[in-house]
């Protein structure tokens, strides 16, 4: 197993690369990783006190 990304290309992340479905590019580790779906719930009815918080669907494992 290689030592770490710093020894390869420093800590500055390159531009994201295309990933297969169910994956996305993680700037932290600079690789494609398992990814869930981000979603924004439908707005609450008029008069609701605050906007619905943004949530997400868990990654499919």
């Amino acid at each position: 197993m290689r030592r770490g990304p710093r020894s390869l290309r420093g800590r500055d992340a390159p531009a994201p690369t295309p990933c297969v479905p169910a994956e996305c590019f993680d700037l932290l580790v600079r690789h494609c990783v398992a990814c869930g779906l981000l979603r924004t719930p439908r707005p609450k009815p008029a008069g609701a006190s605050s906007p619905a918080p943004r949530t997400a669907l868990q990654p499919q494992e």
């Epitope: 996305c24 993680d26 932290l28 580790v29 600079r30 690789h31 990783v33 981000l38 997400a56 990654p59």
Partner: antibody
Framework: EVQLVESGGGLVQPGGSLRLSCAAS????????IHWVRQAPGKGLEWVAW????????DYADSVKGRFTISADTSKNTAYLQMNSLRAEDTAVYYC??????????????????WGQGTLVTVSS | DIQMTQSPSSLSASVGDRVTITCRAS??????VAWYQQKPGKAPKLLIY???FLYSGVPSRFSGSGSGTDFTLTISSLQPEDFATYYC?????????FGQGTKVEIK
């Protein structure tokens, strides 16, 4: 159910070694990054190392580089932290954690969503 | 490495209060900031990720905002179970770094 369970902590003399294990269940560690984070008594959180098993990619905090080695066995769904040349300042509760990612325009939006219960490492003579 | 500076380091508040904790990054981290809650003897819990997204199961009284270098965690109405220590963390560039923590105590 996703779960992380650490083991391997204990009392060790300065200069000694320990290997911590982080057994995962409910998901495959292969395509997620697994992190070790420690917390010295009464102090804050300090990131130690991460591994992305599918890529064989790792990184370390400067404070442990050259002394600690992170690894993973995907067949056992377990990550490890080999700690050598231990010092008094390595005394801490060590947690393993999974970084979860959500797809935001093709890029990960995420955080460490599941953590183990922690295992105490005490370095003392 | 990117430094994450939280303020205040501690605060006293009462149940029902609105509480705001801030975190400043030493360089631009876009929206790659998460917030965690930790209680004594327990592992941290993820509250907010990507600066403003509420993690699954977290009460909606928690919210996050910010981008670039300045970030905020807000608890709209403090509940008894919210007395804990809160940490920010950036994950834009390795190494991922944590703030020093903010302890929320009962007034």
């Amino acid at each position: 159910e996703v779960q992380l369970v650490e083991s391997g902590g204990g009392l060790v003399q300065p200069g000694g070694s320990l290997r911590l294990s982080c057994a995962a269940s409910g998901f495959s560690i292969a395509r997620s990054s697994i992190h070790w984070v420690r917390q010295a008594p009464g102090k804050g959180l300090e990131w130690v190392a991460w591994i992305l098993p599918s890529a064989g990619s790792t990184d370390y905090a400067d404070s442990v580089k050259g002394r600690f080695t992170i690894s993973a066995d995907t067949s056992k769904n377990t990550a490890y932290l080999q700690m050598n040349s231990l010092r008094a300042e390595d005394t801490a509760v060590y947690y393993c954690a999974r970084r979860v990612c959500y797809n935001r325009l093709g890029v990960c939006a995420g955080g460490m969503d599941y953590w183990g219960q922690g295992t105490l490492v005490t370095v003392s003579s | 490495d990117i430094q994450m500076t939280q303020s205040p380091s501690s605060l006293s508040a009462s149940v029902g209060d609105r509480v705001t904790i801030t975190c400043r990054a030493s360089q631009d981290v876009s929206t790659a900031v998460a917030w965690y809650q930790q209680k004594p003897g327990k592992a941290p819990k993820l509250l907010i990720y990507s600066a403003s997204f509420l993690y699954s199961g977290v009460p909606s009284r928690f919210s996050g905002s910010g981008s670039g270098t300045d970030f905020t965690l807000t608890i709209s109405s403090l509940q008894p179970e919210d007395f804990a220590t809160y940490y920010c963390q950036q994950s834009r560039i390795t190494p991922p770094t944590f703030g020093q923590g903010t302890k929320v105590e009962i007034k």
